[in-house]
């Protein structure tokens, strides 16, 4: 006669977090007299996640009515799995006895693997604006997902980049992982507008990969270019001069006007014209009495833009 | 689905007997085979399980004169060293106790132990 | 090795009684439930009526209920027919495989 088997049909499954996981086990025989375990591991540290005899497990539940005269499916349903459940489920047969049980046979263990969805990829930028032609650097992290197996690309506008280093953690085995990656981008002056895109793609995802976004408006500074310019006598004794401040980005902008390196006027930039790039252009005008001045007059437009070093540009006004 | 029990009937005391409990319509191997006694006018008593290979137990009294055997059809009981207070209709019944309680019985075997 | 009492040792009653037996056992049944109930005619050998202290078994009518855990056990006949008119034992099993015990047996009489 052959002596009980403990039958675990699964040597794996795969469960959805959230979901329930069914871990199968039957035996050959209701003999000996006894009761069915359910431990997470093996070994002497091994976690009981199920007893048919005592105790209270109150996400578990069993397949059959193990009060059913002749039951031999000892399958239990495990409800709202998460990463943490994740290991090597055995179905173990003690035989009665005193004053401990004595464990019968084990079944061979199914593998419970779950698939844990990788949270929104959270995208951020350099702490300083950086100005065009500078490399920055931008991160993507996302975390919480299992398997390990998970796709990272990046873009720029719909263009994929490819100077970019990812890692995944941690590098053994564990119940869900995160990624991280960091990605290096040109900056143009066309870049206002720009967006990097982090998309992540797993086997959850039933591929509609999740996206991160920056938005590089939030990273770069477009200084201004200057021109100063003098207009026609608008009076006999008056010279209009104009500072046009063009292409610049952010909008923080304060203009001061010189003459002969006196401080005449400060204003703060208002009324800007923004262009299709999103750079902004802003003009400024100087009104000069003529008649004030014996010798020529050296105006300087003076600009400080974004709390950068101010930059200038001179007119030298002929006073004849 | 039954059992029927045989080989009860009239011993000397010390004699030996054995007795057969043959199942129809099931089969054994995959339950335990206890056996149960009832003294003329008396309760019932616990003898104990024949399961498979080494599962075999008996209650502490009768430990040692009574073992017992099965195949897939048929489970015995080997009883030694008989006394009159043995004398009893002996019943085998499918279960083990517990969550294999003993569902189906056989219609008992007579034993009597005397000179 | 576990000990089991029945009472009362006797109980008459006539139809339709509701008829209460208890059975009580001398420490913890194996898991708190290792209890079966179990009905003999004269003559007869013994038919399973309940297992696991409060399972009814296949086929037993539902005027049939067991209840009670760890030491104290009840069989209750709702409304007793002609044809319960015997003796009810309960088995009890203790932690080791072997322990299995029967009490005194209680028998109903009619009136």
């Known amino acids: 006669e052959e002596e009980l088997q403990v039958i675990q049909p699964d040597k794996s499954i795969s469960v959805a977090a959230g979901e329930s996981a069914t871990l199968h086990c039957t035996v050959t025989s209701l003999i000996p007299v006894g009761p069915i375990q359910w431990f997470r591991g093996a070994g002497p540290g091994r976690e009981l996640i199920y007893n048919q005899k005592e105790g209270h497990f109150p996400r578990v539940t069993t397949v059959s009515d193990l009060t059913k005269r002749n039951n031999m499916d000892f399958s239990i349903r495990i409800s709202n799995i998460t990463p943490a459940d994740a290991g090597t489920y055995y179905c173990v047969k003690f035989r009665k006895g005193s004053p401990d049980h004595v464990e019968f046979k084990s079944g061979a263990g199914t593998e419970l693997s779950v698939r844990a969805k990788p949270s929104a990829p959270v995208v951020s930028g350099p702490a300083a604006r950086a100005t065009p032609q500078h490399t920055v650097s931008f991160t993507c992290e996302s975390h919480g997902f299992s398997p390990r197996d998970i796709t990272l690309k990046w873009f720029k506008n719909g263009n994929e980049l490819s100077d970019f280093q990812t890692n995944v953690d941690p590098a053994g085995d564990s119940v869900s992982y995160s990624i991280h990656s960091t990605a290096k981008v040109v900056l143009t002056r066309e870049d206002v507008h720009s967006q990097v895109i982090c998309e992540v793609a797993h086997v959850t995802l039933q591929g509609d990969p999740l996206r991160g976004t920056a938005n590089l408006s939030e990273t770069i500074r477009v200084p201004p270019t200057l021109e100063v310019t003098q207009q026609p006598v608008r009076a006999e004794n008056q010279v209009n001069v104009t500072c046009q401040v063009r292409k610049f980005y952010p909008q923080r902008l304060q203009l001061t006007w010189l003459e002969n390196g006196n401080v005449s006027r400060t204003e703060t930039a208002s009324t800007l014209t923004e262009n299709k790039d999103g750079t902004y252009n802003w003009m400024s005008w100087l009104l000069v009495n003529v008649s004030a001045h014996r010798d020529d007059v050296k105006l300087t437009c003076q600009v400080e833009h974004d709390g950068q070093p101010a930059v200038s540009k001179s007119h030298d006004l002929k006073v004849s | 689905r039954q059992l029927v029990e045989s080989g009860g009937g009239l011993v000397q005391p010390g004699g030996s007997l054995r007795l057969s409990c043959a199942a129809s319509g099931f089969s054994l191997s995959s339950h335990g085979i206890s056996w149960v006694r009832q003294a003329p006018g008396k309760g019932l008593e616990y003898i104990g399980t024949?399961?498979?290979?080494?599962i075999t137990y008996y209650a502490s009294w009768a430990k040692g004169r009574f073992t017992g055997s099965k195949t897939s059809s048929t489970a015995y009981l080997q009883m030694t060293s008989l006394r009159a207070e043995d004398t009893a209709v002996y019943y085998c019944?499918?279960?083990?106790?517990?969550?294999?309680?003993?569902?189906?019985w056989g219609q008992g075997t007579l034993v009597t132990v005397s000179s | 090795d576990i000990e089991m009492t029945q009472s009362p040792s006797s109980v008459s009653a006539s139809v339709g009684d509701r008829v209460t037996l208890t059975c009580q056992a001398s420490q913890s049944v194996y898991g708190n439930n290792d209890l079966a109930w179990y009905q003999q005619k004269p003559g007869q050998a013994p038919k399973l009526l309940i297992y696991?202290?409060?399972t009814l078994a296949t086929g037993v009518p539902s005027r049939f209920s067991g209840s009670g855990s760890g030491t104290d056990f009840t069989l209750t006949i709702s409304s007793l027919q002609p044809e319960d008119f015997a003796t009810y034992y309960c088995?009890?099993?203790?932690?080791?495989?072997?322990?299995?015990?029967f009490g005194g047996g209680t028998k109903v009489e009619i009136k």
């Open positions: 088995l009890g099993g203790g932690d080791d495989e072997a322990d299995n015990v």
């Open positions: 024949i399961g498979t290979g080494v």
């Open positions: 696991l202290a409060s």
């Open positions: 019944a499918r279960g083990s106790a517990w969550n294999d309680p003993f569902d189906y």
